[in-house]
Interface confidence: medium
């Protein structure tokens, strides 16, 4: 996955901005072998979103899209 | 003071196309996103599809998908819902509404006046 | 898609009295990201675009009378008109507002007894 703050199929950094909820599509977790752990969220337009797992607001984000893949 | 203002009534025959406009003013118009509900003459209210002004991002209900598209101009503050080929089924009146400013999905905030389509040969 | 169904279609009330409205969906609608329940309540008076009176599941929008309150969780939702006025005769929808498409229900219209 390319786009904010990804490279490779690592991440790189994590994004600072609010995650835009209504634009995302799914989500996965980076690889082990990554040096840095990372969820990315995949927006409706392909955009990849490089997220700390261990922020709040990113598990909340991650069980929503749970709840709307099992909907 | 927040309006959405919509077209005024139109009549139609069968296989005519048509495009209908809601104009948003009285806040930022590409911070919300805009959606279009059909009532039916004595029905209730059926949720078609919402659009994000911001950059045309679009999302119908499976049970619209295809039978309409809808747009947005974000110069003129204007949201649209249009028809290549109209049916006499799709006589009813049709509302804008403004999408609420939640992070998640929202209730409808705001309401345009309505727009009365009538299809009839 | 969310199924919601209303109950009753029509509810006729004396002047004053309480009117109940319930509004059940086929599946829950606890956003898992705000933990609130995602459930609208409208009023569409005749001649009228619907008006928000009541989001997620029990907050009143701005300038709608206190007489409006909205309760439940999961997928059982009621609205309550605790003293019925004239100018509350409508047809009342729920709309769920946790996934796309944000479905109504068919409508409960409230008339005086």
């Known amino acids: 996955a390319r786009g904010t703050n990804v490279g490779r199929e690592c991440c790189l950094e994590y994004f600072k901005g609010a995650i835009p909820l209504r634009k995302l599509k799914t989500w996965y977790q980076t690889s082990e072998d990554c040096s840095r752990d990372a969820i990315v969220f995949v927006t409706v337009q392909g955009r990849a979103i490089c997220s700390d797992p261990n922020n709040k607001r990113v598990k909340n984000a991650v069980k929503y899209l749970q709840s709307l893949e099992r909907s | 003071e927040v309006q959405l203002v919509q077209s005024g009534a139109e009549v139609k025959k069968p296989g005519e196309s048509l495009k209908i406009s809601c104009k948003g003013s009285g806040y930022s118009f590409t911070s919300y996103w805009i959606g279009w509900v059909r009532q039916m003459p004595g029905k209730g209210l059926e949720w078609m599809g919402i659009i994000d002004p911001s950059d045309s991002d679009t999302r119908y209900s499976p049970s619209f998908q295809g039978q309409v598209t809808i747009s947005a101009d974000k110069s003129i503050s204007t949201a649209y819902l249009q028809w290549s080929s109209l049916k006499a089924s799709d006589t009813a009146m049709y509302y804008c509404?403004?999408?609420?400013?939640?992070?998640?999905?929202?209730?409808?905030?705001?309401w345009g006046q309505g727009t009365l389509v009538t299809v009839s040969s | 898609d969310i199924v919601m169904t209303q109950s009753p279609d029509s509810l006729a009330v004396s002047l004053g009295e309480r009117a109940t409205i319930n509004c059940k969906s086929s599946q829950s609608v606890l956003n898992s990201f705000t933990n609130n329940n995602a459930l609208a309540w409208y009023q569409q008076k005749p001649g009228q675009p619907p008006k928000l009176l009541i989001y997620?599941?029990?907050t009143r929008e701005s300038g709608v009378p206190d007489r409006f309150s909205g309760s439940g969780s999961g997928t059982d939702f009621t609205l309550t008109i605790s003293s019925l006025q004239a100018e509350d005769v409508a047809v009342y929808y729920c709309?769920?507002?946790?996934?796309?498409?944000?479905?109504f229900g068919q409508g409960t219209k409230v008339e005086i007894k």
């Open positions: 509404a403004r999408v609420g400013p939640a992070d998640v999905w929202d209730s409808f905030d705001y």
């Open positions: 997620e599941a029990s």
């Open positions: 709309q769920q507002t946790n996934s796309i498409p944000l479905t």
